[in-house]
Protein backbone atom coordinates (compact mmCIF):
# COMPACT_ATOMS: atom_id res chain seq x y z
CA UNK A 1 0.00 0.00 0.00
CA UNK A 2 1.26 3.47 -0.93
CA UNK A 3 0.95 5.93 1.97
CA UNK A 4 -1.44 8.81 1.30
CA UNK A 5 0.47 12.02 0.69
CA UNK A 6 -0.83 15.56 1.03
CA UNK A 7 -0.56 17.93 -1.95
CA UNK A 8 2.62 19.58 -0.68
CA UNK A 9 4.32 16.22 0.02
CA UNK A 10 3.30 15.00 -3.46
CA UNK A 11 4.82 18.09 -5.05
CA UNK A 12 8.01 17.88 -3.00
CA UNK A 13 8.50 14.17 -3.75
CA UNK A 14 8.91 14.95 -7.47
CA UNK A 15 12.10 16.89 -6.68
CA UNK A 16 15.32 15.58 -5.09
CA UNK A 17 15.89 16.08 -1.37
CA UNK A 18 16.53 19.70 -0.40
CA UNK A 19 14.48 21.01 -3.34
CA UNK A 20 10.79 21.73 -3.92
CA UNK A 21 8.70 22.01 -7.06
CA UNK A 22 8.03 25.54 -8.35
CA UNK A 23 4.35 26.35 -7.62
CA UNK A 24 3.78 27.88 -11.09
CA UNK A 25 6.00 25.59 -13.14
CA UNK A 26 6.16 21.91 -12.17
CA UNK A 27 9.18 21.31 -14.40
CA UNK A 28 11.36 23.47 -12.15
CA UNK A 29 12.87 22.32 -8.86
CA UNK A 30 13.97 25.15 -6.56
CA UNK A 31 16.42 24.82 -3.68
CA UNK A 32 14.74 25.05 -0.28
CA UNK A 33 15.68 27.83 2.14
CA UNK A 34 18.04 27.06 5.02
CA UNK A 35 16.76 27.09 8.59
CA UNK A 36 16.68 30.63 9.93
CA UNK A 37 15.42 31.91 6.59
CA UNK A 38 12.12 31.90 4.68
CA UNK A 39 11.04 31.96 1.03
CA UNK A 40 10.81 35.48 -0.35
CA UNK A 41 10.70 34.54 -4.06
CA UNK A 42 10.79 31.18 -5.86
CA UNK A 43 13.79 30.52 -8.12
CA UNK A 44 13.17 32.03 -11.60
CA UNK A 45 14.45 28.95 -13.46
CA UNK A 46 16.40 25.66 -13.25
CA UNK A 47 19.77 26.05 -11.52
CA UNK A 48 18.95 29.58 -10.41
CA UNK A 49 18.91 30.65 -6.78
CA UNK A 50 15.83 30.76 -4.61
CA UNK A 51 15.44 34.16 -2.94
CA UNK A 52 15.55 33.41 0.80
CA UNK A 53 15.54 36.09 3.48
CA UNK A 54 16.56 35.84 7.13
CA UNK A 55 13.77 35.67 9.69
CA UNK A 56 13.11 38.90 11.52
CA UNK A 57 13.45 39.24 15.27
CA UNK A 58 10.68 37.38 17.08
CA UNK A 59 10.38 34.71 14.40
CA UNK A 60 12.21 31.55 13.32
CA UNK A 61 12.37 28.50 11.05
CA UNK A 62 13.95 25.41 12.59
CA UNK A 63 14.50 23.37 9.42
CA UNK A 64 14.99 23.82 5.67
CA UNK A 65 11.73 25.05 4.22
CA UNK A 66 9.81 26.94 1.57
CA UNK A 67 7.57 28.84 3.96
CA UNK A 68 6.35 32.29 2.89
CA UNK A 69 6.65 33.53 6.49
CA UNK A 70 8.77 32.61 9.47
CA UNK A 71 7.01 31.15 12.51
CA UNK A 72 6.32 33.36 15.54
CA UNK A 73 8.49 32.62 18.56
CA UNK A 74 6.69 30.95 21.45
CA UNK A 75 6.33 32.86 24.69
CA UNK A 76 6.78 31.08 28.00
CA UNK A 77 3.57 31.21 30.03
CA UNK A 78 4.37 32.98 33.28
CA UNK A 79 0.92 32.19 34.69
CA UNK A 80 1.88 28.50 34.41
CA UNK A 81 5.12 29.12 36.31
CA UNK A 82 7.20 28.57 33.16
CA UNK A 83 10.65 30.10 32.77
CA UNK A 84 12.71 30.68 29.65
CA UNK A 85 15.48 28.10 29.33
CA UNK A 86 16.81 29.55 26.06
CA UNK A 87 15.75 32.51 23.97
CA UNK A 88 14.32 32.31 20.48
CA UNK A 89 16.85 32.60 17.66
CA UNK A 90 16.24 32.76 13.90
CA UNK A 91 16.68 28.98 13.68
CA UNK A 92 15.29 27.78 17.01
CA UNK A 93 12.09 28.43 18.96
CA UNK A 94 12.08 29.59 22.57
CA UNK A 95 12.65 26.72 25.01
CA UNK A 96 10.47 26.93 28.11
CA UNK A 97 10.82 24.87 31.27
CA UNK A 98 10.43 24.84 35.05
CA UNK A 99 12.65 26.01 37.88
CA UNK A 100 14.88 23.69 39.90
CA UNK A 101 12.94 21.28 42.15
CA UNK A 102 9.83 21.59 39.99
CA UNK A 103 8.22 19.27 37.45
CA UNK A 104 5.88 19.68 34.49
CA UNK A 105 2.21 18.76 34.56
CA UNK A 106 0.73 18.69 31.05
CA UNK A 107 -2.79 20.04 30.57
CA UNK A 108 -2.54 19.21 26.87
CA UNK A 109 0.10 17.89 24.49
CA UNK A 110 2.09 21.13 24.52
CA UNK A 111 0.79 23.16 27.47
CA UNK A 112 2.40 22.47 30.83
CA UNK A 113 2.29 24.00 34.29
CA UNK A 114 5.15 23.90 36.79
CA UNK A 115 4.59 22.38 40.24
CA UNK A 116 6.95 22.00 43.19
CA UNK A 117 8.35 18.51 43.70
CA UNK A 118 6.97 16.77 46.79
CA UNK A 119 9.45 16.62 49.69
CA UNK A 120 7.96 13.41 51.18
CA UNK A 121 7.61 14.81 54.70
CA UNK A 122 6.59 11.96 57.06
CA UNK A 123 7.80 9.52 54.42
CA UNK A 124 10.71 8.59 52.19
CA UNK A 125 11.49 9.23 48.52
CA UNK A 126 10.65 6.11 46.52
CA UNK A 127 11.33 7.72 43.10
CA UNK A 128 13.06 11.06 42.65
CA UNK A 129 11.31 13.99 40.99
CA UNK A 130 11.70 13.96 37.19
CA UNK A 131 11.15 16.56 34.48
CA UNK A 132 7.58 15.36 33.86
CA UNK A 133 6.79 13.48 37.06
CA UNK A 134 6.50 14.36 40.72
CA UNK A 135 8.47 12.58 43.43
CA UNK A 136 6.91 9.25 44.40
CA UNK A 137 6.69 9.01 48.19
CA UNK A 138 6.38 6.05 50.56
CA UNK A 139 4.80 7.04 53.87
CA UNK A 140 6.00 6.13 57.34
CA UNK A 141 3.80 4.00 59.61
CA UNK A 142 0.83 5.98 60.89
CA UNK A 143 0.62 8.01 57.67
CA UNK A 144 -1.13 7.46 54.33
CA UNK A 145 -0.60 8.93 50.85
CA UNK A 146 -3.12 11.55 49.71
CA UNK A 147 -2.38 13.61 46.60
CA UNK A 148 1.27 12.59 46.99
CA UNK A 149 1.56 13.89 50.54
CA UNK A 150 1.89 11.79 53.67
CA UNK A 151 -1.11 12.58 55.86
CA UNK A 152 -1.58 11.39 59.45
CA UNK A 153 -3.89 8.40 59.88
CA UNK A 154 -5.84 10.51 62.37
CA UNK A 155 -7.25 12.25 59.25
CA UNK A 156 -8.41 8.93 57.77
CA UNK A 157 -12.19 8.67 57.51
CA UNK A 158 -13.85 5.28 57.17
CA UNK A 159 -15.19 6.05 53.67
CA UNK A 160 -11.72 6.81 52.25
CA UNK A 161 -9.31 4.28 50.71
CA UNK A 162 -6.82 4.98 53.52
CA UNK A 163 -8.74 2.67 55.87
CA UNK A 164 -6.74 -0.37 54.64
CA UNK A 165 -3.40 1.40 55.14
CA UNK A 166 -4.42 2.86 58.49
CA UNK A 167 -6.38 -0.17 59.75
CA UNK A 168 -3.81 -1.20 62.43
CA UNK A 169 -3.77 2.37 63.79
CA UNK A 170 -7.57 2.63 63.75
CA UNK A 171 -7.85 -0.70 65.57
CA UNK A 172 -5.22 0.40 68.09
CA UNK A 173 -7.17 3.57 68.81
CA UNK A 174 -10.32 1.49 69.33
CA UNK A 175 -8.36 -0.96 71.48
CA UNK A 176 -7.05 1.76 73.80
CA UNK A 177 -10.56 3.19 74.12
CA UNK A 178 -12.01 -0.26 74.89
CA UNK A 179 -9.27 -1.18 77.39
CA UNK A 180 -10.41 1.60 79.69
CA UNK A 181 -13.77 -0.10 80.29
CA UNK A 182 -13.75 -3.11 82.61
Amino acid sequence: LVPHLGDREKRDSVCPQGKYIHPQNNSICCTKCHKGTYLYNDCPGPGQDTDCRECESGSFTASENHLRHCLSCSKCRKEMGQVEISSCTVDRDTVCGCRKNQYRHYWSENLFQCFNCSLCLNGTVHLSCQEKQNTVCTCHAGFFLRENECVSCSNCKKSLECTKLCLPQIENVKGTEDSGTT
Epitope: S74, W107, N110, E147
Partner: nanobody
Framework: EVQLLESGGGLVQPGGSLRLSCAAS????????MYWVRQAPGKGLEWVSG????????YYADSVKGRFTISRDNSKNTLYLQMNSLRAEDTAVYYC?????????????????WGQGTLVTVSS
Protein backbone atom coordinates in the same frame (compact mmCIF):
# COMPACT_ATOMS: atom_id res chain seq x y z
CA GLU B 1 -23.09 12.32 23.39
CA VAL B 2 -21.03 14.57 25.68
CA GLN B 3 -23.17 16.68 27.99
CA LEU B 4 -22.01 19.27 30.52
CA LEU B 5 -24.72 20.90 32.60
CA GLU B 6 -23.80 23.83 34.84
CA SER B 7 -25.86 25.08 37.79
CA GLY B 8 -25.50 27.28 40.87
CA GLY B 9 -25.23 30.71 39.26
CA GLY B 10 -27.26 33.69 40.44
CA LEU B 11 -27.18 37.20 41.86
CA VAL B 12 -24.83 37.77 44.79
CA GLN B 13 -23.52 40.84 46.61
CA PRO B 14 -19.82 41.80 46.47
CA GLY B 15 -17.90 39.79 49.05
CA GLY B 16 -20.43 36.96 48.83
CA SER B 17 -20.00 33.33 47.83
CA LEU B 18 -21.43 30.89 45.29
CA ARG B 19 -20.79 27.27 44.45
CA LEU B 20 -21.12 26.20 40.83
CA SER B 21 -21.67 22.58 39.83
CA CYS B 22 -21.24 20.82 36.50
CA ALA B 23 -22.91 17.45 35.93
CA ALA B 24 -21.06 15.50 33.22
CA SER B 25 -22.27 12.60 31.09
CA UNK B 26 -21.53 10.85 27.78
CA UNK B 27 -17.81 10.31 28.46
CA UNK B 28 -15.52 8.75 31.07
CA UNK B 29 -15.39 11.66 33.53
CA UNK B 30 -12.66 10.29 35.86
CA UNK B 31 -10.13 10.08 33.01
CA UNK B 32 -10.55 13.69 31.81
CA UNK B 33 -8.97 16.93 32.97
CA MET B 34 -11.80 19.42 33.53
CA TYR B 35 -11.98 23.21 33.35
CA TRP B 36 -14.00 26.30 34.18
CA VAL B 37 -14.07 29.11 31.62
CA ARG B 38 -15.94 32.41 31.83
CA GLN B 39 -17.09 35.18 29.53
CA ALA B 40 -17.80 38.62 30.98
CA PRO B 41 -20.30 40.88 29.14
CA GLY B 42 -18.68 42.24 25.98
CA LYS B 43 -15.37 40.48 26.67
CA GLY B 44 -13.49 37.42 25.43
CA LEU B 45 -13.28 34.01 27.04
CA GLU B 46 -11.05 33.56 30.08
CA TRP B 47 -9.75 30.22 31.33
CA VAL B 48 -10.50 30.49 35.05
CA SER B 49 -9.47 27.14 36.51
CA GLY B 50 -8.51 23.55 35.75
CA UNK B 51 -8.25 20.27 37.64
CA UNK B 52 -6.53 17.03 36.68
CA UNK B 53 -8.12 13.57 36.78
CA UNK B 54 -7.29 12.82 40.42
CA UNK B 55 -7.61 16.36 41.72
CA UNK B 56 -3.95 16.69 42.71
CA UNK B 57 -3.07 19.38 40.14
CA UNK B 58 -5.05 22.59 39.84
CA TYR B 59 -4.70 25.78 37.82
CA TYR B 60 -6.14 29.20 38.66
CA ALA B 61 -6.01 32.40 36.64
CA ASP B 62 -4.25 35.20 38.56
CA SER B 63 -7.56 37.10 38.72
CA VAL B 64 -9.20 34.39 40.90
CA LYS B 65 -6.21 32.90 42.78
CA GLY B 66 -6.89 32.60 46.52
CA ARG B 67 -10.63 33.22 46.09
CA PHE B 68 -11.85 30.35 43.90
CA THR B 69 -11.42 26.62 44.55
CA ILE B 70 -11.97 23.94 41.93
CA SER B 71 -12.79 20.37 42.97
CA ARG B 72 -14.37 17.23 41.54
CA ASP B 73 -16.25 14.14 42.68
CA ASN B 74 -15.43 11.34 40.24
CA SER B 75 -18.01 9.02 41.84
CA LYS B 76 -20.74 11.57 41.00
CA ASN B 77 -19.27 12.73 37.64
CA THR B 78 -19.45 16.28 38.94
CA LEU B 79 -17.12 19.27 38.78
CA TYR B 80 -17.36 22.17 41.26
CA LEU B 81 -16.19 25.77 41.56
CA GLN B 82 -16.36 27.37 44.99
CA MET B 83 -16.27 31.15 44.54
CA ASN B 84 -15.58 33.32 47.59
CA SER B 85 -14.97 37.07 48.07
CA LEU B 86 -16.80 37.73 44.81
CA ARG B 87 -16.19 41.03 43.00
CA ALA B 88 -18.15 42.94 40.37
CA GLU B 89 -15.51 41.93 37.79
CA ASP B 90 -16.40 38.25 38.38
CA THR B 91 -19.77 38.88 36.71
CA ALA B 92 -19.84 36.52 33.71
CA VAL B 93 -21.34 33.41 32.20
CA TYR B 94 -19.39 30.46 33.63
CA TYR B 95 -18.86 27.39 31.46
CA CYS B 96 -17.70 23.91 32.36
CA UNK B 97 -15.38 22.52 29.64
CA UNK B 98 -13.26 19.53 28.63
CA UNK B 99 -10.63 18.76 25.98
CA UNK B 100 -8.10 21.59 26.17
CA UNK B 101 -5.91 22.44 23.15
CA UNK B 102 -3.18 25.02 22.84
CA UNK B 103 -0.68 25.72 20.10
CA UNK B 104 2.24 27.88 21.15
CA UNK B 105 1.81 30.42 18.36
CA UNK B 106 -1.93 30.98 18.77
CA UNK B 107 -2.08 32.37 22.32
CA UNK B 108 -5.43 31.42 23.87
CA UNK B 109 -6.48 27.90 24.79
CA UNK B 110 -9.39 26.14 23.10
CA UNK B 111 -11.77 23.46 24.35
CA UNK B 112 -13.57 20.61 22.57
CA UNK B 113 -16.76 20.66 24.62
CA TRP B 114 -18.66 23.25 26.66
CA GLY B 115 -21.81 23.37 28.71
CA GLN B 116 -24.56 25.93 28.10
CA GLY B 117 -23.23 28.09 30.95
CA THR B 118 -24.59 29.57 34.16
CA LEU B 119 -24.79 33.33 34.78
CA VAL B 120 -23.09 34.79 37.84
CA THR B 121 -23.97 38.43 38.63
CA VAL B 122 -22.09 40.24 41.39
CA SER B 123 -23.86 43.46 42.25
CA SER B 124 -25.06 45.43 45.25
Amino acid sequence: EVQLLESGGGLVQPGGSLRLSCAASGFTFPTEHMYWVRQAPGKGLEWVSGIDTGGSHTYYADSVKGRFTISRDNSKNTLYLQMNSLRAEDTAVYYCAKGLHWSSDSGPVHFDYWGQGTLVTVSS
